[in-house]
Interface confidence: medium
């Protein structure tokens, strides 16, 4: 029960996280103009990964996409790439984890397969979260560098009428959304990995039992059936040994060195 809860919670947390990463990637407020010490301007600028926006004092807002790749800095391209990789990995992770959920039965899928899928999706969520956190952090670092350079330029060129006002930009809402979303995806991934340990069946120590039958050679099959040569009376493969019978949820049978005696 605890395993199912951990897995389900991990899935939900990751789902919220990935939705947040997608939202952050699409948002325009990655950087917003810092209006401190610049009361003259009637224009407020803010930028996203994909477009730049201008809001005028009248309330009119206009956004315009970056229609070129060549003029954009490599760092911005890197941030875009990290966020997209994070979304893609997260989306695949979600798809895998849906089939891995213990509460969902798909055919005769064994717990070992579900455990592997849970682990896979967990790792994908962790990497997805790390990509988002890395992307947002790289952009934040660019902003901080630009901010302090702008501040330095502001106070070194104040003689007479200032020809250039180095506009300072500060953290936009998208950065905070991205950090939180990346963290949630990471936490969800860790929960999935923890759930995987509970899902994985423990190694069963099979007892070696030898069977002696008169007249025919007998082999023990993993399912507990007598393998008939075809000449005996047990042609319908009836179960002849049920001593160690357990329910499907209690134990899964795997081929091991003790399967054939």
């Amino acid at each position: 029960m605890a395993v199912t809860a951990c897995q389900g919670l991990g899935f939900v947390v990751s789902l919220i996280g990935i939705a947040g990463i997608i939202a952050a990637t699409c948002m325009d407020q990655w950087s917003t103009q810092d209006l401190y010490n610049n009361p003259v301007t009637a224009v407020f600028n803010y930028q996203g990964l994909w477009r730049s926006c201008v809001r005028e004092s009248s309330g009119f807002t206009e956004c315009r996409g970056y229609f070129t790749l060549l003029g954009l800095p490599a760092m911005l391209q890197a941030v875009r790439a990290l966020m997209i990789v994070g979304i893609v990995l997260g989306a695949i992770g979600l798809l895998v984890s849906i089939f891995a959920l213990k509460c969902i039965r798909i055919g005769s899928m064994e717990d070992s397969a579900k455990a592997n899928m849970t682990l896979t999706s967990g790792i994908m969520f962790i990497v997805s979260g790390l990509c988002a956190i890395a992307g947002v952090s790289v952009f934040a670092n660019m902003l901080v560098t630009n901010f302090w350079m702008s501040t330095a330029n502001m106070y070194t060129g104040m003689g007479g009428m200032v020809q250039t006002v180095q506009t300072r930009y500060t953290f936009g809402a998208a950065l905070f959304v991205g950090w939180v979303a990346g963290g949630l995806t990471l936490i969800g991934g860790v929960m999935m990995c923890i759930a995987c340990r509970g899902l994985a069946p423990e190694e069963t120590n099979y007892k070696a039992v030898s069977y002696h039958a008169s007249g025919h050679s007998v082999a023990y099959k993993p399912g507990g059936f007598k393998a008939s040569t075809g000449f005996g009376s047990n042609t319908k493969n009836k179960k002849i040994y049920d001593g160690g019978a357990r329910t499907e949820d209690e134990v899964q049978s795997y081929p091991s060195k003790h399967d054939y005696v």
Epitope: S31, T41, N45, Q47, F60, R64, N146
Partner: nanobody, 121 residues
């Protein structure tokens, strides 16, 4: 080095016309809007007209119907056509633009040195 240079100011009689020009020079990657401000003696600087990246124009109430802002993106120029000038339009007119330099993400605000417009009979 990016620079804005205005021209076209001067003395004009009330009811007359003037055309101000502003040229942006340097390695400019993107223009995030161009504006005209003015500052009358003893008053605060005010926004007169602006043109957005896609060409939408806005005007201060005091100049609506008399002033027209336009631009030529290829030449990196903006213009302010001033008609039916009044004595209260007397001020130093400043060209202002938000420009992104090549290889940059964020726009900086650039100002021209200002050109004086005097409306007097």
């Amino acid at each position: 080095q990016v620079q804005l240079v205005e021209s076209g100011g001067g003395l004009v009689q009330p009811g007359g016309s003037l055309r101000l020009s502003c040229t942006a020079s340097g390695s400019i990657f993107r223009i995030d809007g161009m504006h005209w401000y003015r500052q009358a003696p003893g008053k605060q600087r005010e926004l007169v007209a602006s043109i957005t990246p896609s060409g939408i124009t806005h005007y201060a109430d005091s100049v609506k119907g008399r002033f027209t802002i336009s631009r030529d993106i290829a030449k990196k120029m903006q213009y302010l056509q001033m008609n039916s000038l009044k004595p209260e339009d007397t001020a130093v007119y400043y060209c202002n633009a938000h420009l992104v330099k090549v290889g940059g993400v964020w726009s900086d605000e650039y100002w021209g040195q200002g050109t004086l417009v005097t409306v007097s009979s």
